[in-house]
């Protein structure tokens, strides 16, 4: 974490030594990219790489920054006024219900089904029935059968873990 | 001179709830982050909540979050702790104090929370 | 979170002897945001030291604080009667702000 500048008129036990850049708190807000000290005197920059803030606020701590996780990629890293930007790697997805890892999709639709969307960061393949046209829950059956690319080999069961 | 004086304590049974007052005087109430700490009988210091000068940031302990708020009137110049769900591990002296991070550079003299059957 | 330990538990020493006491962090904590105070029963705590190295106001020029980084000590160079207590360190650096267990200085 950042530290205080000194200033004169400050008590002496509110003072620390002078490490970051200081501004004013405006209306008693600072800037993204800094956190407010706890006399409400100076906007203290957060650390590079270590933690930020997005918006004008009073925050006493910048925000940590988030560490990708195994199985993510790093799209873009923290600074000081954005957080890390993490994503799935290539064949992996993270969905809105378990936004915590990364789950691996699904190799193919189920008999009866054809795809019609890929496998994304955010989103597992998407399959319809052939038939009817309606989506594929996504969940999957305790045995299911995957269409494989050369007929009459045995179907091999989808998994979902990551 | 700055003075805190808190107020509000008492016995309470498991599960009831309490609020803490903290009136304080002797320095610009409205531009200073606060904090609650608390002891337990014959513990050591343990943080328990911090809000900024505006009450617009407010920071709690794991072992309260989602149980104690706390929360500024500068019109007052008072700091409050609402207590909630409270437990028998919660017994403690509860002092306010001015700071958070650099120090608690002046702290009240405390007021004791009794959590009992 | 950061774990301060403090060293020794108890300190067993003499008025007019040097006491030296420990205050370890779990991870690196900015000297800015490390402070030590002195308890005596029934009392509140008392701010000694801020910034690691910096007296608080009013407080003796026999107390005074050094180290950086996860290291740091609280030295009281001479005991006086009144000094006997126990001392706590404690670091904003990081949330949640945490304090160490306590070292008592009690009477030889």
């Known amino acids: 974490e950042s530290a205080l500048i000194t200033q004169q008129d400050l008590a002496p036990q509110q003072r620390a030594a002078p490490q970051q850049k200081r501004s004013s708190p405006s209306e008693g807000l600072c800037p993204p990219g800094h956190h407010i000290s706890e006399d409400g005197r100076d906007c203290i920059s957060c650390k590079y790489g270590q933690d930020y803030s997005t918006h004008w606020n009073d925050l006493l701590f910048c925000l940590r920054c988030t560490r990708c996780d195994s199985g993510e990629v790093e799209l873009s890293p923290c600074t000081t006024t954005r957080n890390t930007v993490c994503q799935c790697e290539e064949g992996t997805f993270r969905e809105e219900d378990s936004p915590e890892m990364c789950r691996k999709c699904r190799t193919g639709c189920p008999r009866g089904m054809v795809k019609v969307g890929d496998c994304t960061p955010w989103s597992d393949i998407e399959c319809v029935h052939k038939e009817s046209g309606t989506k594929h829950s996504g969940e999957v059956p305790a045995v299911e059968e995957t269409v494989t690319s050369s007929p009459g080999t045995p179907a091999s069961p989808c998994s979902l873990s990551g | 001179e700055v003075q805190l004086l808190e107020s509000g304590g008492g016995l309470v049974q498991p599960g009831g709830s309490l609020r803490l007052s903290c009136a304080a005087s002797g320095f610009t109430f409205s531009s200073y982050a606060m904090s609650w700490v608390r002891q337990a009988p014959g513990k050591g210091l343990e943080w328990v909540s911090a809000?900024?000068?505006?009450?617009?940031?407010?920071y709690y302990a794991d072992s309260v979050k989602g149980r104690f708020t706390i929360s500024r009137d500068n019109s007052k110049n008072t700091l409050y702790l609402q207590m909630n769900s409270l437990r028998a591990e919660d017994t403690a002296v509860y002092y306010c104090a001015k700071g958070v991070r650099i120090s608690f550079d002046y702290w009240g003299q405390g007021t004791l929370v009794t959590v009992s059957s | 979170e950061i774990v301060l330990t403090q060293s020794p538990g108890t300190l067993s020493l003499s008025p007019g002897e040097r006491a030296t006491l420990s205050c370890r962090a779990s991870?690196?904590?900015?000297?800015?945001?490390l402070a030590w105070y002195q308890q005596k029963p029934g009392q509140a705590p008392r701010l000694l030291i801020y910034g690691a190295s910096s007296r608080a106001t009013g407080i003796p020029d026999r107390f005074s604080g050094s180290g950086s980084g996860t290291d740091f000590t609280l030295t009281i160079s001479r005991l006086e009667p009144e000094d006997f207590a126990v001392y706590y360190c404690?670091?904003?650096?990081?949330?949640?702000?945490?304090f160490g267990q306590g070292t008592k200085v009690e009477i030889k």
């Open positions: 991870q690196s904590v900015s000297s800015s945001y």
């Open positions: 404690q670091q904003g650096s990081n949330q949640p702000v945490t």
């Open positions: 809000i900024s000068g505006s009450g617009g940031s407010t």
